[in-house]
Each structure stands twice: as structure tokens, then as C-alpha cells.
């Protein structure tokens, strides 16, 4: 890598550098190379981008062969095809305010990344992009005719907004039920929710059910057949008892769980049903909880962040089990 050897360039033609990267002579004055950028490793032969005020910092002792491209004080920045002076602030888009400092660009978001938890005034909050607005804003997914000022969440139908099935109308109530959200846990016991106004007072309420996509202790990858990349619905060898906060299900269940993939896909429930499960606690108390039971799973690349209940609420819906007056088929 030093300059004592004879000039030898890898290719006759000059290399094609990415946008914003300078084409420079190497440190030996031999070959044209793409300049190394801020933070990249550099050598005498692989110099840093001089047009951005970068130098190869070999550290101390300075006799090392490999350094890191570092910005000189006051070095400018190249960002999005424009050059900014050190200390200069600019808006890269309506969502970010950026500053150039000694060759490095730092940006801060201008849009709030706030989370909104459900409440009587906003039972099913969602972030949406509104026309003419840069930042996403919270909307509350309520019927248009909700009382104008308070949290009385009656969904009485005043206008033909939803095109309802007449069989779903009850005493001037437009019955609406969302699909169940994805399970809040990718393994072990979690919670799945939905919103409905299918109740005596036609009030929007959030329903929840327990769910288990797969047990955490199962090593499902072992069961994937040779040449296959996924196991969609592995057979569970023996009936299981569910556990919930120290309480155990009274009955045993031969439940279906979703498998795993080795190719980056994730397997999630596709068709589900809801059944009541009785749990017996150490103090003798019996409690009945609705629980999701998996009928079929699907393997796909739409894999949001694990165990992010807010993400799972809105992006990974489950199909089936949309019955309005009964909880299982």
C-alpha cells in the first residue's frame, strides 16, 4: 500500500464514483480512485476526499499504515447534492432540520414522534398523512356523527357514511367491529385487541383476548425439512395447558401454533377463532378469559418490529373471527 512500488492501477479506465464522491489521484500520484468519505478507512494509496476538507487521520503513533477519514475543523458538508458550510443549518425536507458541523451532517426531526394511548375521547388512535400537511397527525377513528364535544362514544347513524348491511343495524345503531389486531408478543402469551360498538348502548369499546403465536421455548427451526425454508404450522406433539400470571388453564388444549422461516420471512396467524378458556389460580380463584386459537398461519415478508404493540395494532391484522354476536365459529 505504500508508494515505493511501481505504479500499477487496477483498471485502465477511471472508476465510476457514486454521486457526491470525488475522483482523485491516489496518494502516490499514480491512479485515479474514488475518494474515501468521512469515517471510512484510508491509506496512502486510498486518500480521503479533499473537496470535503477530509484528511487521513493515522492517529498516534502516526506511523500506522491505516487511518480514518476525519474532517478538518470547519470542513463543509455535501448533502443531497448541495454543499453546506460548517455551522450552516438547512431543512433537508419538511420533516428534518439539519446542521453541518466539520463535515458531518446531523438532523433532528421537526415532526413529533409522539405516541397516543387509547382513551374514552380517542379509543382507537391512528397516525395519518393529511393532504397539505407535512407531518402525520393523530386521528381518532370515530364515527362522523359522534357528539361534537365530549367522549360519549355513541355511533348513531345520521348519514349514510358506511354503507351498512341492514341486518347489522340494531335500534338505530350501526354495528362496527374491527378485525383483531396481531398478537402483542411473537412468542409466549400476549394480547390481541379489537374495537366494537356491538353492545347494549352502542358504545365503542375495546375488546381483548389472550393469544399465543408460538411457545417461546419451542425450537421450531429444528423441524424444518431439508430443502424447505419454512414450517408454517408445526404439529404440536402433546396437548398443552396455558399459563397466565401464575394461573393455569383448567383444560388441556391441542392448539395449533405458527412456525418459523430461515429465509427472513415471518409466520403469523391468518385465520383465527376466539374461545373462552378457564384459568385456575393458586388461591383457588377461577377466571374465564377469551383466547385466540389459530386455524391457519401464513408466512410472509411483512414483518414489523417484534413485540411492538403500537405497530402490531395497526399493521398486522388477522383475518376471520369477525363475528358480531358470537365469539367463535
Amino acid at each position: 500500500q505504500d508508494c515505493s512500488a511501481q505504479c500499477q492501477c487496477a483498471a485502465e479506465a477511471a472508476p465510476h464514483c457514486p454521486a457526491g464522491v470525488s475522483l482523485v489521484l491516489d496518494g502516490c500520484g499514480c491512479c485515479r480512485v474514488c475518494a474515501k468519505q468521512l469515517g471510512e478507512l484510508c491509506t496512502e494509496r486510498d486518500p480521503c476526499d479533499p473537496h470535503k476538507g477530509l484528511f487521513c487521520d493515522f492517529g498516534s503513533p502516526a506511523n500506522r499504515k491505516i487511518g480514518v477519514c476525519t474532517a478538518k475543523d470547519g470542513a463543509p458538508c455535501v448533502f443531497g447534492g448541495s454543499v453546506y458550510r460548517s455551522g450552516e443549518s438547512f431543512q433537508s425536507s419538511c420533516k428534518y432540520q439539519c446542521t453541518c458541523l466539520d463535515g458531518a451532517v446531523g438532523c433532528v426531526p421537526l415532526c413529533s414522534m409522539d405516541v397516543r394511548l387509547p382513551s374514552p375521547d380517542c379509543p382507537f388512535p391512528r397516525r395519518v398523512k393529511l393532504p397539505g400537511k407535512c407531518c402525520e397527525e393523530w386521528v381518532c377513528d370515530e364515527p362522523k356523527d359522534r357528539t361534537a364535544v365530549g367522549p360519549a362514544l355513541a355511533a348513531y347513524r345520521l348519514e349514510d357514511t358506511f354503507g351498512p348491511d341492514p341486518t347489522m343495524m340494531r335500534a338505530n345503531c350501526l354495528v362496527q367491529t374491527t378485525e383483531w389486531s396481531a398478537c402483542s408478543k411473537t412468542c409466549g402469551m400476549g394480547i390481541s385487541t379489537r374495537v366494537t360498538n356491538d353492545n347494549t348502548f352502542c358504545r365503542l369499546e375495546k375488546q381483548s383476548r389472550l393469544c399465543m403465536v408460538r411457545p417461546c421455548e419451542a425450537d421450531l427451526e429444528e423441524n424444518i425439512k431439508k430443502g424447505k425454508k419454512c414450517i408454517r404450522t408445526p404439529k404440536i406433539a402433546k396437548p398443552v395447558k396455558f399459563e397466565l400470571s401464575g394461573c393455569t388453564s383448567v383444560k388441556t388444549y391441542r392448539a395449533k401454533f405458527c412456525g418459523v422461516c430461515t429465509d427472513g420471512r415471518c409466520c403469523t396467524p391468518h385465520r383465527t377463532t376466539t374461545l373462552p378458556v378457564e384459568f385456575k389460580c393458586p388461591d383457588g380463584e377461577i377466571m374465564k378469559k377469551n383466547m385466540m386459537f389459530i386455524k391457519t398461519c401464513a408466512c410472509h415478508y411483512n414483518c414489523p418490529g417484534d413485540n411492538d404493540i403500537f405497530e402490531s395494532l395497526y399493521y398486522r391484522k388477522m383475518y376471520g373471527d369477525m363475528a358480531h354476536h358470537h365469539h367463535h365459529h
Epitope: S112, D114, V115, R116, L117, P118, S119, P120, D121, C122, P123, P125, E137, W138, T147, A148, V149, G150, P151, A152, S184, I191, T193, R203, E205, K206, Q207, S208, I309
Partner: antibody
């Protein structure tokens, strides 16, 4: 950054009206409701009332006759007025954002004494 | 008058699991009560941990989970840390008003 800040007189005379303001930054009071809560010395929390994002109000029934909560959306401020105060109204008063009571002010101590 | 009851105090060892409950005097707690859990650490401001029964705030660690258990709202802490020592309040919504519980003082031993 979301912030709520209560302000108002620390001392109020009995039978007078207690007026507090909650100044909000980092979110809009037309998007989130604001609650008022108080805590007597060494005691638990007591919910007093709320002004919802659309301007409607709900009050603790025990305070219905003497409590008024209103808001000035242009200033992003919520005001709290409790009339005919007595020594029993001596407490720390908080405002908090609707939606899980996620953000709270630091509280303002109010003493009712002549 | 509706009364919301919490355990006045609970003690747990670091790494252990503890469940705080919130009982309503007028029947079972449901999702329509939008159970909220609020934490106050000594010398710090209140902050919400859980809203709408089971939804965590962005700063709430995964070891905190909200649920309905046996007709009560519950806050379960798994793998308790020393910094979880605090006062915890629940609040339930009753159609026109909220009611706070009396609070639970959680002590972490050690």
C-alpha cells in the same frame, strides 16, 4: 418535547375562587384533552375534571357546582377555576394529558387560608 | 360513590414478579373502563405507564404489562428492577368521569 406547566397563586383566601392555568407545549390541546387532578398532603390522587380535545368537559360530580374548565386553543392553555374554596381544597394541583395520563405537569401547591 | 381499590403496599425481590390490581366497587373492570396506570418515583413527576388497559407508553419497559385479571385491572411487573420502587396509581373511566385508586407503594427489597 411534551411539557405541561401549572401556574397560579399559591395562597387563596377561603370563599374566593382558585384560578390556575396549564400551559402546554409539544402538542396541541385541539388534538389531546387535558385533565386536572389534585393530591392532598400525604394522600392519593383525586380526579377533578377534563376538557376534551373538542372542547367538551366532564367533571367529578363532587365539584360540578363550583368547577369550570375552559381552554384557549390559540395560546395552547387550559384554565381551571374552583369557586368557594375552603381549607379542604388545600392540595397540590396537576394538569395531565389525555391518553393514558402519559404526561403530567410538576404540580402547583395551593394553600387556602385567611 | 364509586370506589377504586388498590393494595396499599406490596414488596418484591429484584428479579421477581409482582401483580398490582385495581378493583372497582361496582362490578368487573372491562376494557370500557380504559384502565390507566400512573407511576410516581420519589422526587419525580407523575408519568403514565399504561393506557387503555394494556397499551404501554413509549418509555414503559416491556417488563410492565397491563391486563384484566379476574374482573380487575392488573399491572404485572416481571423481572422487577430496583428502579421500579415507586407509588403506582390506577384510574378507571366510568362513562362521565375517572376515579383514581388509592395507590400502591411498591417496595423492592435489597
Amino acid at each position: 418535547e411534551v411539557q405541561l406547566q401549572e401556574s397560579g397563586p399559591g395562597l387563596v383566601k377561603p370563599s374566593q375562587t382558585l384560578s390556575l392555568t396549564c400551559t402546554v407545549s409539544g402538542f396541541s390541546i385541539s388534538t389531546f384533552g387535558v385533565h386536572w387532578i389534585r393530591q392532598h398532603p400525604g394522600k392519593g390522587l383525586e380526579w377533578l375534571g377534563v376538557i376534551w380535545r373538542r372542547g367538551g368537559t366532564d367533571y367529578n360530580a363532587a365539584f360540578m357546582s363550583r368547577l369550570t374548565i375552559s381552554k384557549d386553543t390559540s395560546k395552547n392553555q387550559v384554565s381551571f377555576k374552583l369557586s368557594s374554596v375552603t381549607a379542604a381544597d388545600t392540595a397540590v394541583y396537576y394538569c395531565a394529558r389525555d391518553g393514558g395520563f402519559d404526561y403530567w405537569g410538576q404540580g402547583t401547591t395551593v394553600t387556602v387560608s385567611s | 360513590e364509586t370506589v377504586v381499590t388498590q393494595e396499599p403496599s406490596l414488596t418484591v425481590s429484584p428479579g421477581g414478579t409482582v401483580t398490582l390490581t385495581c378493583r372497582s366497587s361496582i362490578g368487573a373492570v372491562t376494557t370500557s373502563n380504559y384502565a390507566n396506570w400512573v407511576q410516581q418515583k420519589p422526587g419525580q413527576a407523575f408519568r403514565g405507564l399504561i393506557g387503555g388497559t394494556s397499551n404501554r407508553a413509549p418509555w414503559t419497559p416491556a417488563r410492565f404489562s397491563g391486563s384484566l385479571l379476574g374482573g380487575k385491572a392488573a399491572l404485572t411487573l416481571s423481572g422487577v428492577q430496583p428502579e421500579d420502587e415507586a407509588e403506582y396509581y390506577c384510574a378507571l373511566w366510568y362513562s362521565t368521569h375517572y376515579v383514581f385508586g388509592g395507590g400502591t407503594k411498591l417496595t423492592v427489597l435489597g
